[in-house]
Amino acid sequence: MMTGTIETTGNISAEKGGSIILQCHLSSTTAQVTQVNWEQQDQLLAICNADLGWHISPSFKDRVAPGPGLGLTLQSLTVNDTGEYFCIYHTYPDGTYTGRIFLEVLESSVAEHGARFQIP
């Protein structure tokens, strides 16, 4: 039975040209995290594998930095980066947990972070 929940940074906004940290946290389970995939729609950004380290998709290698932790840092943001991002936690023995973050990249200098929220 899957008892865990994923807490994410929720709906967030950032300035064009700036950077943002995409962060998820798995709680309420003792399951072992074996791999985390970071995806934007149907595009893979990066994989963090507990044994192997990081695989950064070449399409994003100049703008994506691993971490902090299992999170992902997006740099040199453009308005085209606006959209949904998913953290997919592969765990043993529970299986797969998915968290969603919505990022809005703003032209203006006013970019406030949204509240944290949980996905069961």
Epitope: Q35, L52, H55, K61
Partner: antibody, heavy 127, light 112 residues
């Protein structure tokens, strides 16, 4: 010498789920140096990668199929499996399992070529 | 996803003569840590593909030295210096630098 052998039905009814298993012999699926893939080939056509699994359970699926695909691993039986749901005639193909090499360096890893392939059963979708 | 385009579609070669197959990528297969993850496969009739070349130019163990691979960026080539009867089949290139892995459409080689 590592060998891969697929097992599963040759005929699947439309809308049903295909289940295939790839048995690894001559080596351990727990080796951290490899990723384990499924690839299919439609009759008279080219090759389409379905997805991979690492021995510890991490996966990535081809976005074109990911809503229907599940790949799992059973290290105690030294095998990995493919499930493909909602089968249609367009899923009629030869299904191969294959082993790929992983290159890991300085905290990063990369996927190299597929060096061992199974024989590949033909799966036909028909009622 | 990365699209690989192979040319020609088919090739008819006299035994002992050379053959060359091109594989062009829709985007640069930039080297990661100095390596480009482009491999070549031969699928003989009725059999699964077998790896010939990995990381652009490295021959897999047991592969005859008449097979060679080269290229960089978006353009890659498989050369057979002297084609033999056992070389017939369909040749595929595959990139694994970016997921999903993708294959070229294949080049069918036959003997004249």
């Amino acid at each position: 010498q590592v060998q891969l052998q697929e097992s599963g039905p040759g005929l699947v009814n439309p809308s049903q789920t295909l289940s295939l298993t790839c048995i690894v012999s001559g080596g351990s699926i727990r080796s951290g140096d490899y990723y384990w893939s499924w690839i299919r080939q439609h009759p008279g056509k080219g090759l389409e990668w379905i997805g991979y699994i690492y021995y510890s359970g991490g996966t990535y699926y081809n976005p074109s199929l990911k809503s229907r695909v599940t790949i799992s691993v059973d290290t105690t039986k030294n095998q990995f499996s493919l499930k493909l749901s909602s089968m249609t005639a367009a899923d009629t193909a030869v299904y191969y399992c294959a082993r790929g090499s992983i290159a890991a360096r300085s905290g990063y890893f990369y996927f190299s070529g597929l060096d061992v392939w199974g024989q590949g059963p033909t799966v036909t979708v028909s009622s | 996803e990365i699209v690989l385009t192979q040319t020609p579609l088919s090739l008819s070669v006299t035994p002992g003569q050379p053959a060359s197959i091109s594989c062009k990528s829709s985007q640069s297969l930039l080297p990661s840590e100095g390596k480009t993850y482009l491999s070549w496969y031969l699928q003989k009739p009725g059999l699964p593909p077998q790896v010939l070349i990995y990381e652009v130019s490295n021959r897999f163990s047991g592969v005859p030295d008449r097979f060679s691979g080269s290229g960089s960026g978006t353009d890659f080539t498989l050369k057979i210096s002297r084609v033999e009867a056992e070389d017939v089949g369909v040749y595929y290139c595959m990139q694994s630098i970016q997921l999903p892995l993708t294959f070229g459409g294949g080049t069918k080689v036959e003997i004249k």
